[in-house]
């Protein structure tokens, strides 16, 4: 426990002290006091530097003194032979004796007392920034007028913090400006403006004089601006070193002025004002801003319109423009929205054609549609090339957004028919020679495919069976082969209105208008064994002349059997109608004169016994197109004949083209796109 005074005596004092002793005393007086230590008796073996025996006085790490020998007081009125004054409240006294003493030494007697110290004057480091006041056992600091004592109770500063500026314009200066600013102060000023306005600070170079930086470049006194997570400064020196106009991009600004104890200058003065928060003129690619301005500020609204071929995609909805507002935080609303290239998407597939997978489906990309050649061609032109247009559609120069239509190529057999030997008198044929040939199994007959949905045949073939079963693509009509071929299902049968329906068809003598159309339920897929025959044109080029050659095909009666198993065909010349009239009817069901011959009939055959016969009815009499030798058209349909192996009569298809076209148009189903 600290004491105010005390006595220290060497061992055995006042008797001689023993050899080889080391004894120490720790003196402690209360905090705020120093120690006055004085010796009233000193009798210790003398040696150089008191090396043998000694009394040592230590204050902290400092040796205040080392005593030996004999002393006596210089003052007859005072018993003190040696004294020490320390401004600290702790002291150590150490007594040491060596192994031998040549004489008898009595040691020492010492006393200590607590003494007041003057903290204001006794130390190198002044404890108070301004005024120091000493009292017994301590001191206190005080401040000049308008200063206040900081919490450390040592430093004085000015009360320059706490001001909040909310006006849109104002002026702030350091304390006492332009007189020197207070030392050892931290001044904080707050500017708080309405959201959407940024604080802009303006200074003049001459309005700034703050203690300069040290040799390491650190400001001893400093002015700092803090706006959110952005800091401007610290600034110091003679003349403002920073930008004279500081745009803080924030509606809140803290100004911090920190001074140290030395080097006071005149300080600083600044002006501030609130600018509507600017929003950057962002570079939004592929778009136009309306209105266009050099600078945009809080509450400005712009319409951002995408250039042609670009769109704003938000969710699943595409738009060509959007509005953006300059917000209070200096950021644009809808800033995530961008003008992206229009995506036309995966192009639609087309029937009987294809489009190669595009590398890109974005604006400006090009795709090409092609038809499944050689069985289909592009009917509506345009070349099949489409580009991704600005409106998000695939567009063709000719057709616009309309898709190309792949329609069957007509009248082109994959393999030409060659007569191999001398249908009656005909040759074996392959379905590839006559891909338009349709087989009807009840009654056993033929027909001609004229497009994906329509079969042309003779009226007498379908008059007794309005739901005929038809097959395409097979050379053989064996049940096993037909099972593997394409069966066509009828939707409706259209018999020519001029065809006379009889109660007993077997007795028919009038085959005028022997033509019918069968509308199919489903479109036929074309290929090497299935492909339509062309219809005749309406020009005079398609008027047949005697001797013109045509091909007939079918599975009808041959010389060898009543029904052909494999397709037969023959090449026949057109003959004058009278040649047909002259032939005697083989099994007449009526008087020979009763048989009707009209201009709607073509007579053909009569050469080498080549003729159509029972079971060939409805098949095409195919003639080379006069305007395109690669194609065949249906000039006639097998209708009737007086006698197999002579001349046969064929319905003249040219006379019915208008009826065929009209019937097909009126009964076409709109394509389900």
């Amino acid at each position: 426990e600290p004491t105010m005074y005390g006595e220290i005596l060497s061992p055995n004092y006042p008797q001689a002290y023993p050899s080889e002793v080391e004894k120490s005393w720790d003196i402690e007086v209360p905090e705020g006091y120093g120690i006055h230590l004085y010796f009233t008796h000193l009798d210790i073996e003398l040696s150089e530097n008191c090396a043998y025996d000694s009394v040592q006085i230590i204050s902290g790490d400092t040796e205040e003194g080392r005593l030996c020998g004999q002393r006596s007081s210089n003052n007859p009125h005072s018993p003190i032979v040696e004294e020490f004054q320390v401004p600290y409240n702790k002291l150590q006294v150490i007594f040491k004796s060596d192994f031998s003493n040549e004489e008898r030494f009595t040691g020492f007697a010492a006393y200590y007392v607590a003494t007041d110290i003057n903290e204001c004057t006794d130390f190198v480091d002044v404890p108070c920034s301004h005024f120091c006041n000493n009292f017994i056992g301590g001191y206190f600091c005080s401040c000049p007028p308008e200063y206040f004592l900081h919490d450390d109770m040592k430093n004085c500063g000015v009360n320059c913090s706490g001001d909040v500026f909310t006006a849109l314009i104002g002026e702030i200066a350091s304390p006492n400006y332009p007189k020197p600013y207070p030392e050892n102060s931290r001044c904080e000023y707050q500017i708080r403006l309405e959201k959407g306005f940024q604080v802009v600070v303006t200074l003049r170079r001459e309005d700034f004089d703050v203690e300069a930086a040290d040799s390491a470049g650190n400001c001893l006194d400093s002015l700092v601006f803090v706006a959110g997570d952005r800091q401007f400064g610290p600034y110091c020196g003679h003349g403002f070193p920073g930008p004279l106009n500081i745009e803080t991009k924030s509606n809140a600004l803290d100004i911090i002025f920190q001074t140290d104890l030395t080097g006071q200058k005149k300080g600083w003065k600044l002006r501030y004002h609130g600018d509507p928060m600017p929003c950057p003129k962002e570079d939004t690619p592929n778009s136009v801003w309306e209105p266009a301005k050099a600078k945009y500020v809080f509450r400005d609204v712009v319409q951002i319109t995408c250039l042609d071929g670009f769109e704003v995609v938000e969710g699943r909805v595409g738009a060509t423009s959007f509005y953006s507002t300059c917000q209070s935080n200096g950021k644009w609303s809808n800033s995530k929205l961008k003008c992206q290239p229009v995506d036309c998407g995966i192009p639609e597939s087309i029937e009987n054609g294809k489009v190669e997978d595009p590398e890109s489906t974005l604006f400006g990309s090009v795709i090409r549609y092609t038809c499944e050649e050689p069985y289909y061609y592009m009917e509506n032109g345009g070349g099949g090339e489409y580009h991704c247009a600005g409106n998000g559609s695939w567009v063709n120069e000719v057709l616009g957004p309309e898709l190309p239509k792949c329609v069957p190529v007509c009248g082109v057999p994959r393999e030409p028919f060659e007569e191999k030997q001398r249908i009656i008198g005909g040759s074996d044929a392959d379905i590839k020679n006559f891909p338009w040939q349709v087989f009807f199994d009840n009654p056993w007959a033929g027909g001609a495919l004229i497009n994906e949905y329509w079969v042309l045949t003779a009226a007498h073939v379908v008059e007794g069976n309005r739901e005929p079963t038809m097959y395409v693509g097979s050379t053989s009509v064996q049940t096993s082969r037909l099972a593997k071929s394409k069966m066509l299902t009828p939707e409706h049968v259209f018999i020519h209105p001029g065809w006379k329906l009889l109660e007993v068809p077997e007795g028919r003598t009038n085959f005028d208008n022997d033509i019918a159309l069968v509308r199919l339920k489903d479109p036929v897929k074309m290929g090497p064994t299935v492909s339509p025959i062309c219809l005749p044109g309406t020009s005079s080029d398609y008027n047949l002349m005697d001797g013109d050659l045509g091909l007939i095909s079918g599975w009808g009666r041959t010389e060898k059997r009543d029904r052909a198993v494999r397709l037969k065909a023959a090449r026949l010349p057109v003959a004058p109608l009278r040649k047909c009239k002259e032939v005697k009817v083989e099994k007449p069901t009526a008087d020979a004169e009763a048989y009707v011959f009209t201009p709607n009939m073509i007579c053909a055959g009569g050469e080498k016994g080549m003729d159509s016969c029972k079971g060939d009815s409805g098949g095409a009499f195919a003639v080379q197109d006069p305007n395109d030798k690669t194609k065949f058209y249906a000039a006639g349909l097998v209708s009737w004949g007086p006698q197999c192996g002579t001349y046969g009569l064929y319905t003249r298809v040219k006379n019915y083209v208008d009826w065929i076209m009209k019937t097909m148009q009126e009964n076409s189903t709109p394509r389900e796109d």
Epitope: D441, T469, V477, Q478, T479, S480, R481, M487, R563, V565
Partner: antibody, heavy 125, light 107 residues
């Protein structure tokens, strides 16, 4: 050359079984229907059974129904007649014959245009 | 079942004779009928199909006619190789049925 060759005939006790085979060559077997016809010694012809080109349709004479089974293996160009529960009256010369079937949904049969030489089946105790 | 009745069951004729064999169906069979020739120890051979169509390779002296229930096979001029047994076959419906046969012998 179109040819049909029967085999598998022989002597069997009543109640026994036999399997006749008919090997076809010289034509596309799976394009034709096939028939079995038998002829008892000194008697006329009797149609026994028939099968269409792909084996999906069969027919039998009343006298063999439930006892005989006709089948075909198009991959092997072969026709078969499995005869079970044989009776003495099944003793006969068994022919296989080719049937032509034309047309699709509505078809036309041309039966037995080609015949084999036959194989003899004797049912005796 | 459709019964086929053939007549006569046998006949004697001379070379060069015109021979007619008849087959009657118990119900109408349209023209679904064939005629077969069988010689002793041989397999039958088709002569006519669909009542009137001559099988390829068969001499034209053979002809068939009829429809419905009455059918006829005619040999216009009998030849030595024509002596055989003749059968008709109906294939209108299952079970197929043969006629009892007509044996043509040398007179």
């Amino acid at each position: 050359e179109v040819q049909l060759v029967e085999s598998g005939g022989g002597v069997v006790r009543p109640g026994g079984s036999l399997r006749l085979s008919c090997a076809a060559s010289g034509f596309t077997f799976d394009d034709y229907g096939m028939s079995w016809v038998r002829q008892a010694p000194g008697k006329g012809l009797e149609w026994v059974s028939g099968i269409n080109w792909e084996g999906g349709s069969t027919g039998y004479a009343d006298s063999v129904k439930g006892r005989f089974t006709i089948s075909r293996d198009n991959a092997k160009n072969s026709l078969y007649l499995q005869m079970n529960s044989l009776r003495a009256e099944d003793t006969a010369l068994y022919y296989c014959a080719r049937d032509e079937q034309l047309g699709g949904k509505y078809y036309y049969y041309y039966y037995m245009d080609v015949w084999g030489k036959g194989t003899t089946v004797t049912v005796s105790s | 079942d459709i019964q086929m009745t053939q007549s006569p069951s046998s006949l004697s004729a001379s070379v060069g004779d015109r021979v007619t064999i008849t087959c009657r169906a118990s119900q109408g069979i349209r023209n679904d009928l064939g005629w077969y020739q069988q010689k002793p120890g041989k397999a039958p051979k088709r002569l006519i199909y669909t009542a009137s169509n001559l099988q390829s390779g068969v001499p034209s002296r053979f002809s068939g006619s009829g429809s419905g229930t009455e059918f006829t096979l005619t040999i216009s001029s009998l030849q030595p190789e024509d002596f055989a047994t003749y059968y008709c076959l109906q294939y209108r419906s299952h079970p197929l049925t043969f006629g009892g046969g007509t044996k043509v012998e040398i007179k």
